[in-house]
């Protein structure tokens, strides 16, 4: 016969553990229900009654199944050099990231302390390594046969067009100028092949930053009573 399903609260078997989305309450010595994300424990369980959960108040949240007495405070509003990429809800903290064209130069435990503007590569130099959420752009000189004519944090060195008849030879900061009407693109060493035409203006595409948590927050649950034996009490 299948084992009877126990309804919370219940006493675990000796040496046993509580089930998923339950926790062991040391005071009641029972397995009790956790509260879902967006809620917190308003009343802890007893031997005869289960946990009573309540919704998080405005500007507070819980992201995990939990038994915290109070929801966590969302981080303060994003500073002027950052943008809110995720709003504070009952189930998630606010997430702030640096504005487009900026990167997190000085991080802190959660989020970014100071954003700085990305460097750009000048004509004759292309992006060797694009900027990320936490690192600046790295530039490199355009190799022979390639050029960049922009000041950009995204543009790479591109191959000179190959001319049947060259009017003006290309250099690191200028494409070749042809007298014929049908130039082709070379595949110069180190050049990146681009399947479609690239505008000579900077594209201004930004690296997609990995989100950072707004300041003053933590996802850690309080250290609660231990179950009788180690086991999964998480999601």
């Amino acid at each position: 016969l299948p084992a009877q399903v126990a309804f919370t609260p219940y006493a675990p078997e000796p040496g046993g553990t509580c089930r998923l989305r339950e926790y062991y309450d040391q005071t009641a010595q029972m397995c009790c229900s956790k509260c879902p994300p967006g809620q917190h424990a308003k009343v802890f369980c007893t031997k005869t009654s289960d946990t009573v959960c309540d919704s998080c108040e405005d500007s507070t949240y819980t992201q995990l199944w939990n038994w915290v007495p109070e929801c966590l405070s969302c981080g303060s509003r994003c500073s002027s050099d950052q943008v809110e990429t995720q709003a504070c809800t009952r189930e998630q903290n606010r997430i702030c990231t640096c504005r487009p064209g900026w990167y997190c130069a000085l991080s802190k435990q959660e989020g970014c302390r100071l954003c700085a503007q990305l460097r750009k590569c000048r004509p004759g130099f292309g992006v060797a390594r694009p900027g990320t959420e936490t690192s600046d752009v790295v530039c490199k000189p355009c190799a022979p046969g390639t050029f960049s004519n922009t000041t950009s944090s995204t543009d790479i060195c591109r191959p000179h067009q190959i001319c049947h008849v060259v009017a003006i030879p290309g250099n690191a900061s200028m494409d070749a100028v042809c007298t014929s009407t049908s130039p082709t693109r070379s595949m110069a060493p180190g050049a990146v092949h681009l399947p479609q035409p690239v505008s000579t203006r900077s594209q201004h595409t930004q690296p997609t930053p990995a989100p950072s948590t707004a300041p003053g927050t933590s996802f850690l649950l309080p250290v609660g009573p231990s179950p009788p034996a180690e086991g999964s009490t998480g999601d």
Epitope: D81, L106, A116, R122, S202
Partner: antibody, heavy 125, light 109 residues
């Protein structure tokens, strides 16, 4: 030749307004951010505002309190500083400045490598 | 971030060495620049990223430090070095009130 030149300074009465211009030449204007920095007679440098042409974003020092507005005209390669409710404390030489273009191929907007000669603004009662 | 420069004024003999200090109110790693300004002229960038020499600046000018403490050292002082020197952090945004230090006047005797 990379160059910034300010204009529009002069004598203005207390509480009045003035619009300064900063004309850029020889630079990739739409990719270069421009700041305004001022210096009162015999005093230090004070950063005022910044405009980032390719993102259209602006920043102001906390003390500006909405009295100054930075803007740009991309077609004319010019950045403006509109100043209102001027006081004697605003008497200064106003510089426009742009980032540092290094010989190793970087344009770094964090530092000011290119400056205009400045334009003097005098606020009198 | 507030930048504090010391001393306000310093004198040096020709051929000597001048040291100027700049303290940031919080850690700015190496995001710091030094400028030289002579009367009637705009500032000139000397050092960026705390220790990198700007184009055309002689090697007798040296920047050092990181975090909150920074130093500008000019060795083999010449008459031409008489000027006011400023430090600047690289984070000018709408959170900024003080971007530059107060300045240090260098008098060459």
């Amino acid at each position: 030749q990379e160059q910034l030149v300010e204009s529009g300074g002069g004598l203005v009465t207390l509480g009045g307004s003035l619009k300064l211009s900063c004309k850029a030449s020889g630079i990739d204007f739409s990719s270069y951010g421009i700041s305004w920095v001022r210096q009162a007679p015999g005093k230090g440098l004070e950063w005022i505002a910044y405009i980032y042409p390719d993102y259209g974003s602006t920043d102001y020092a906390t003390w500006v309190n909405g009295r100054f507005t930075i803007s740009l005209d991309n077609a004319q390669n010019t950045v403006f500083l509109q100043m209102t409710s001027l006081t004697a404390a605003d008497t200064a030489t106003y510089f426009c400045a742009s980032g540092y273009a290094s010989s190793s191929g970087y344009y770094d907007p964090k530092y000011f490598g290119l400056w205009g000669p400045g334009t003097l603004v005098t606020v009198s009662s | 971030i507030k930048m504090t420069q010391t001393p306000a004024s310093v004198s040096a003999a020709v051929g000597g060495t001048v040291t100027i200090n700049c303290r940031a109110s919080e850690d700015i790693e190496s995001y710091l620049a030094w400028y030289q300004q002579k009367p009637g002229q705009p500032p000139k960038l000397l050092i960026y990223d705390a220790s990198d020499l700007a184009s055309g600046v002689p090697s007798r000018v040296k920047g050092s430090g990181s975090g909150t403490e920074f130093t500008l050292t000019i060795s083999g002082v010449r008459c031409d070095d008489a000027a006011t020197y400023y430090c600047q952090h690289g984070f000018y945004t709408s959170r900024s009130d003080s971007v530059f230090g107060g300045g240090t006047e260098v008098v060459v005797k």
